[in-house]
Each structure stands twice: as C-alpha cells, then as structure tokens.
Interface confidence: low
Amino acid sequence: SSNLEGRTKSVIRQTGSSAEITCDLAEGSTGYIHWYLHQEGKAPQRLLYYDSYTSSVVLESGISPGKYDTYGSTRKNLRMILRNLIENDSGVYYCATWDEKYYKKLFGSGTTLVVTDKQLDADVSPKPTIFLPSIAETKLQKAGTYLCLLEKFFPDVIKIHWQEKKSNTILGSQEGNTMKTNDTYMKFSWLTVPEKSLDKEHRCIVRHENNKNGVDQEIIFPPIKTDVITMDPKDN
Amino acid sequence: AQKVTQAQSSVSMPVRKAVTLNCLYETSWWSYYIFWYKQLPSKEMIFLIRQGSDEQNAKSGRYSVNFKKAAKSVALTISALQLEDSAKYFCALGEPNHFLNTDKLIFGKGTRVTVEPRSQPHTKPSVFVMKNGTNVACLVKEFYPKDIRINLVSSKKITEFDPAIVISPSGKYNAVKLGKYEDSNSVTCSVQHDNKTVHSTDFEVKTDSTDHVKPKETENTKQPSKS
C-alpha cells in the first residue's frame, strides 16, 4: 500500500539533530506497527515494532534505547522520532503492518532520510534551465523534444512530470538518473511531442521538499512556431 | 540464526522472456513463510507472492515460486517480462511468533532486474543539438542496439555529464548528453553507433533563421519558473 499522492517523501537533517518520520499506511492491522530501515546495498532490517494496545516499543537486539521513539495511536498518525542523528542513519524508513485478511506484510511508501554534516546553501531547491526543440528535429521528424534541466538541489529525492497547459493528463516523458555534482544533485527530463502539440504550452512540474513554500515548481515551456521557416535537409 | 541470501545482485533479460531470481535461506524453524517483494524506483515496497513451507509451489499471475524445502531454496520466476518489471526484488523470511501481528521479516539484499527491449533490427540514431546559454544537450533518438558513444565537440569545455540512455516508448533507445561550454554556439555532437559515426550536422537544415525553433511570443526561455 502507498500514500495517495505516490510522493516519495524525504527528510534532510544535520548530524546531531533529530528527525520525525510519519507513517502512511492505508490498511492492515492497527495494533502493531513495525519500522524497517533499508540502506542501499544492504538488506532491509526491522528496527522495532510498536504495540499500540500497551503503547510500548519493542526494539530489535542491538538497537540502543533512546535512539527511536514512537507515538500516535493509529496507522494514520503514527510517527517515529530519530534522535542524535549520524550519517549512517541515512536510508529509507518504512512503517509496516500485517494484513488482517491475508498473512502478508504491507509497507508504507517509505521516507528517505538524508543525514549530512555539510553546511548547505540556504537555497537547495531545483534550479531549472529549459531547452526548446531544435529546428532540425521539428522539420525532419515532425516532432519536438523539450528538455528540463534541474540543478543544485538537495537532497536527491525529486519527481518530475510533464503536462500540457490546462490539462491534468501526465504526459509520457523520459529522464536521466539523478547525478551528484559537488554537494548537490542534478537531473534532467525530456518530453517528445508530435508537431501538432508544439503550438501548445507545456509544463515541467517538479516536486522537491525544498521547493519554495513546499509547492510543486512549474517550469513553463512556451508554445513554438514551426511554420515560419522553410527548410531543406542536408542529408536525409 | 535466520539468514536470507540473494546472490544475484542484478540480472538483465529481454522483454517477453522469463527471469528466475534465486533466494537461499537459513532457518531452524520447521514451519514458516517466504515472501517476495518488489521495490519500485520510488522506493515503494509491493508484496508479490507468498510461499508457505508446507504448501505447493505458489503461483500468482506471472509470478511463480520454485520451492525446495530440503535445499532451503525459494526461487521466483517472472514470466512474460514487461519493461515495467524493471525494479529491485527482495526475498524475505517470515519469523513465526506465537502472535503473528508481531512477526518480523528477515530480508535478503535484493536483486535488481533490468528488462531490456527485444533483439531487433539495428537502427541508426537521429542526432540533434539543443542549447541554452552555456548549456548544450545532445539528443540521440531511436537507436538500437544500446551501445553508443556520444561526444560533444568543443574546444572550450566547462563540464560534461554522463549520458542518460533510456528505453524509448517504441522499445529502442533514446539518449541525452549534457555539457556546459564557453563556445556553446559552435558545439556539435558526434555519435559512434554500430561501427558508424553520425553527426548532428547531418540533420541540420538550411535556413536563414536562428538555430532553434522560436517561441510564439518573445519570452524568456532561460528559467521561466513559477513557484
């Protein structure tokens, strides 16, 4: 099960500080909520489970008391607090519960925690640059590709999708991997549209936790004229 | 001690084929369950199938389990692979307590599955250059096979990034390589593919206008973002 928006949640914290992670389970047993940590290259492991009937936390062996705390009474408002963070606490944290109808464990959509000792710029939201289709592509292929470059953001968790103006339909786009550049990240996404859509305005919509005011950033790609130029392909 | 081992860190397989993911486990329990989960790029963890230690081989749609209790092996086969099956797959052993709601899962490290397009006719790419300020993007469209070298040709490089190579909706490949150059106006792109070289200049058009399609109105095309 996953949260409704399908949004990858992320939290960035400095070493030594605390973080709060919320649970977003849609179904399953409310009585016992389990917390798992998955770090890249390792097996996911349970940290603890919370018994809501007795409001008690049962820690896995090797987990130091005081590191984690949980509160809340249902799967919708259950939260876990992580204290005295170190870089090795970075990873994806899942809450989970057993399905009441069928013996299987259901996981929340996961929250990525990034713990860093670096002092980041005050603004680590994605900085956009737009690329419009080349004339060669529009004339030779009767299609055009828009490219949306996003730079200097942190942490690396980002979602990009494309829409036409005045439409909520998500268009089929493609994207590169998120790449590390110094202490921040960059990513780009591109959208190829047929000639008939080139005269429409397109939007590259970017979801990132450090966007201004916490809202999706919309990068506008203007409609383009393809009829003003007559062309003669060199070699095609 | 309970332990789960997924020895394959990653596997690749073409669409429509089947892939088998191996999982070995150690347990002192006699009765238990093994679970398979799929982790999407978004990190969402989705339950796929469950195998009981006292049950016949489990099957659910395109997922089937080959369970060998004596060998402590529980292999997952995904048949008729689709591009959307590309993900990381985890095998997990359920620790049975007296009270199932507190049971723990012991996971393996996971196997990354990459589903590739089918073998198909070799297709030469189209190559186009897109520019904005010092930024240059080389767009390489609809090629097969995947192996490709993309070079942005410039004498004044600031920085370059590794290309992104992705499966196109038509099942071929698309790629984009980005770079920053002081002389962006003179940058061209050359591509080595299938022992041939393709240049962006091969696709250029004779025109008395600028290098790029014009916006309908005079708009700032650098960073017209709104929050």
């Epitope: - | 669409v15 089918r118 006719p121």
Partner: antibody, heavy 130, light 107 residues
C-alpha cells in the same frame, strides 16, 4: 514511395502448396517487419504471420502454425509465405503489410515490434479447391 | 489470445450523421489498437493508430478514443466516401487480432 506487391496466388488442390511473394520498394525489409493478413471471401481480416528479418523472429497464427512458413530475402527486398498442406479454409485474398513506425505515446508488453499497418499490398487471391 | 469484439456488425446512416463504432478487448492491450477502413476489392487503409492518433492524410472527422478496454471510432460527419467496412485491430500482443468488422451503409 513505399510499395508492396504480392504475387504467387492461384488455384491449388487441397493438400497442395503455394509460395506467395511480397516485393517491397521504398524501404528495406531488413529494417522493418513484414506481416501477412488474409481475408476469406465476404469475411473479415485475419492476421497470418509476421517476420522481423534482421533478428529472425517469426510469429504465426495458430490456424497456420506448422503448415505456413514466413521468410525474407533481404538481397531481393522480398518477403515470402510458403503455404503447405493447404485446406479449403485457407481460400482468401492474402495481403502483405508493413508496420507504421512512428513514435508511439505508450508502453505495452513486448515493446518495440508492435505497430499498426500503414502500407498494404493490393492482395493476391489463393483458392484451394478440388 | 485477445479477442476484439466489434459492434455493431452493420449500420445504416446518412451523409452528415455522426457515427460511432466500438471495439471491446477481452483483456488489456494498453493503447495498441488501430482502426482501418476497407472498400470492396481494395486493401484496408489505416485511419487511427495508438487508439487515438490520426494517421497522416486521414480527414479530421475521424477520431479514436479509449476507455479501459473499450475503444471507439467516431466519424463526426459522415461523407459519401466514408461508406465502407471498418475494422479494429489490436497489435499489443501476438497473435494480432482484428474485430469482425462494421459495414457502414447508406440509409
């Protein structure tokens, strides 16, 4: 200009054989796929077989599997349909067709090789009768 | 195999009428559906591909749409040259399959 021209049809007795040809021009069969579709008199369209000549992949309808063989000679830019053990129900106009490779805006199982048919030949009539 | 159930099998209409033909796939075929027009003694002609994309050169009065496994071909204003038989086709999975056809006749 893209063109497909079928030939080789005719009257044949049940159990007999026939080889249909599909000569392509305006494109290379090695860079595309070729498909055979038939239409029995007064009936609808029925897909028969497909070939991807560069990879060698072939596909057949259950009704012809084991009796028909699709092939291509890239040097002649021609595709063939070898039809053996012919039956009365194989009587039809046989068309060869080429797929339309435009950028499709969707994903689906199997990926690249699927496309609608934009160019068709004029058809060749095969009559199986004693 | 994916069955394509096309309806109606025939219809009578007048010039200027709006005509709708539907095809239901027995299982998901994504948008890998095409529509063809065929006239007697001629090869089929591609009208619509990818469920809703108009093939080049086809008049804009033809349109296609998809809702789940239901696919629709609409002719917004029937013209004299549109009287023909129409077929849907799924090409998302082998074997490729066609609908049974819809004959559009003059009322």
């Amino acid at each position: 200009e893209v063109q497909l021209v079928e030939s080789g049809g005719g009257l044949v007795q049940p159990g007999g054989s026939l080889r249909l040809s599909c000569a392509a021009s305006g494109f290379t069969v090695s860079s595309s796929s070729i498909h055979w579709v038939r239409q029995a008199p007064g009936k609808g369209l029925e897909w028969v077989a497909s070939i991807y000549s560069s990879s060698g992949y072939t596909y057949y309808a259950d009704s012809v599997k084991g009796r028909f063989t699709i092939s291509a000679d890239t040097s002649k830019n021609t595709a063939y349909l070898q039809m053996n053990s012919l039956r009365a129900e194989d009587t039809a106009v046989y068309y060869c067709a080429r797929p339309y490779y435009w950028y499709p805006y969707y994903y689906w199982s199997g990926g690249w090789e699927y496309a609608a048919f934009d160019y068709w030949g004029q058809g060749t009539l095969v009559t199986v009768s004693s | 195999d994916i069955q394509m159930t096309q309806s109606p099998s025939s219809l009578s209409a007048s010039v200027g009428d709006r005509v709708t033909i539907t095809c239901r796939a027995s299982q998901s075929v994504s948008s890998a559906v095409a529509w063809y027009q065929q006239k007697p003694g001629k090869a089929p002609k591609l009208l619509i591909y990818s469920a809703s994309s108009l093939y080049s050169g086809v008049p804009s009065r033809f349109s296609g749409s998809r809702s789940g496994t239901d696919f629709t071909l609409t002719i917004s204003s029937l013209q004299p040259e549109d009287f023909a038989t129409y077929y849907c086709q799924q090409y998302g999975e082998y074997p490729i399959t066609f609908g049974q056809g819809t004959k559009v006749e003059i009322k």
